[in-house]
């Protein structure tokens, strides 16, 4: 049996990472031991799973790495890799400084809003997560059909504005659809804008007929699929 140890300490010499906002950061703590150790990450001393981070994080345990894409000022801090097995534990601290960049178009978290399947009569939430230097505003749009067509003569889609909101940077914006019907099915777009420009992402809502209670004991209100 052997306590954890760093296998490539020369790759960990760069303790301070100062990167421009929008860049990708990768921290690695390659280690070994017997039994094979596990790795956990802390941010400023607290367990870090990235759930509150736009874009989330990528943990690649086989590479002993933490990857954060499109870093923002709120990502600044001390990142600790904690490697442990039954025999012992080791840790290493990285310091991340995010250099603020010029204001840019809003960045929307990938995969949001998410394609969603729901049953008639259920409630649906579509999420949109925005990062913007300048204060963003959001619109929720539904793509509609007019005279049998989804597009006008100019080639642009017909849309209906469902909701407009001004939000704080890095806030989650939610579109609530209550008691959905077949007519609610279709394409929904989250539009985020600031003084630099607009960004859009879309998702599809599929609405299934009401399930027969004799066949289904309990159906979830909504299923989220990527």
């Amino acid at each position: 049996q052997q306590a954890p140890y760093w296998t490539h300490p020369q790759r960990m010499e760069k303790k301070l990472h100062a990167v421009p906002a929008g860049n990708t950061v990768k921290f690695r703590c390659p280690a070994a031991g017997n039994p094979t150790p596990t790795i956990r990450w802390l941010k400023d001393g607290q367990a870090f799973h990235g759930e509150n981070r736009i874009g989330g994080i990528r943990l690649r345990h086989q590479h002993w790495s933490l990857v954060m894409e499109s870093v923002v000022p709120s990502d600044r801090g001390t990142y600790t890799c904690l490697v442990e097995n039954a025999v012992g534990s080791i840790r290493y601290n990285y310091l991340l400084d995010v250099l603020e960049r010029s204001p840019h178009r809003p960045i929307l978290q990938a995969g949001l809003p998410a394609n969603t399947t729901a049953v008639v009569g259920s409630d649906v939430e579509l999420l949109c997560k925005v990062y913007s230097d300048a204060q963003p505003h959001i619109q929720w749009l539904k793509h509609i059909v007019i005279n049998g067509s989804s597009f006008g003569a100019d080639g642009f889609p017909y849309v209906q504005v469902l909701k407009t909101a001004d939000i704080n940077s890095s806030e989650v914006e939610v579109l609530y659809l209550r008691n959905v019907s077949a007519e609610d099915a279709g394409e929904y777009t989250c539009l985020a804008g600031n003084s630099i420009g607009l960004s859009y992402q879309s998702a599809w809502l599929t609405v299934l007929p009401e399930e027969d209670p004799t066949w289904t004991a309990a159906a979830p209100e909504a299923r989220y699929t990527d």
Epitope: S70, R101, S102, P103, H104, R105, I107, L108, A110, A134, Q135, H137, Q139, L141, G152, D154, F156, V159, V161, T164, L191, G193, N194, S195, I196, G197, L198, S199, Y200, Q201
Partner: antibody
């Protein structure tokens, strides 16, 4: 017809001030960010500043930061550029440009409509 | 700041012949929403710039279909399939992804 009309240009000595205005018509001015772009004689285009639709956000090129102030009066459909401590290198045609709208737009989200420009000459 | 580098500086074209202008950005202009925010303008003598192409390849309303934009991430091209006398002017590319918005140095197109 969508239109932007700049005014206020002229000849001024280095160190002095000048205020440019841009009158907007033919669109809902209060729903659009607005920019100033300049072009020195015989040279290329240089972005100067932007202001959000409600005036809450303003950004400037490093070359004018601390000297120029962008502002707007949505009740009068007017965009302004207050230029202080003018330098010889500020000599240029100043264009007012429509930026991104507050909501869904068909086509480009801004930088589609330019004014005719107003000439500013800084010379001793 | 994002640097936009345009080539060539000038171009002399026979009417009816094609013309091509290149533009390179110092950083990718492909945004998280999947769009590439490069715009192309032409500036004719004594006039403000006029928008030709937006978001890499979309022709602005009223722009003849002999103009086309293409490219990806950092390398962009404006093509005129058959140059006409009215196409004389200075052509600029612009990045519209972050402030400060930046322009290429311009390409002067003249007729032989």
């Amino acid at each position: 017809e969508v239109q932007l009309l700049e005014s206020g240009g002229g000849v001024v000595q280095p160190g002095r001030s000048l205020r440019l205005s841009c009158a907007a018509s033919g669109f809902t001015f209060s729903s659009y960010a607005m920019h100033w772009v300049r072009q020195a004689p015989g040279k290329g285009l240089e972005w100067v500043a932007v202001i959000s639709y409600d005036g809450s956000n303003k950004y400037y090129a490093d070359s004018v930061k601390g000297r120029f102030t962008i502002s707007r009066d949505n009740s009068k459909n007017t965009l302004s550029l207050q230029m202080n401590s003018l330098r010889v290198e500020d000599t240029a045609i100043y264009y007012c440009v429509r930026g991104a709208g507050r909501g869904y737009t068909y086509g480009p989200d801004g930088f589609d409509i330019w004014g005719q420009g107003t000439m500013v000459t800084v010379s001793s | 700041d994002i640097v936009m580098t345009q080539t060539p500086l000038s171009l002399s074209v026979t009417p009816g012949q094609p013309a091509s202008i290149s533009c390179t950005s110092s950083r990718s202009l492909l945004h998280s929403d999947g769009k590439t925010y490069v715009y192309w303008y032409v500036q004719k003598s004594g006039q403000p710039p006029q928008l030709l192409i937006y978001e890499l390849s979309n022709r602005f309303s009223g722009v003849p279909d002999r103009f086309s934009g293409s490219g990806s991430r950092t390398d962009f091209t404006l093509k005129i399939s058959r140059v006409e006398a009215e196409d004389v002017g200075v052509y600029y590319c612009m990045q519209y992804i972050e402030a400060p918005l930046t322009f290429g140095g311009g390409t002067k197109v003249e007729i032989k």
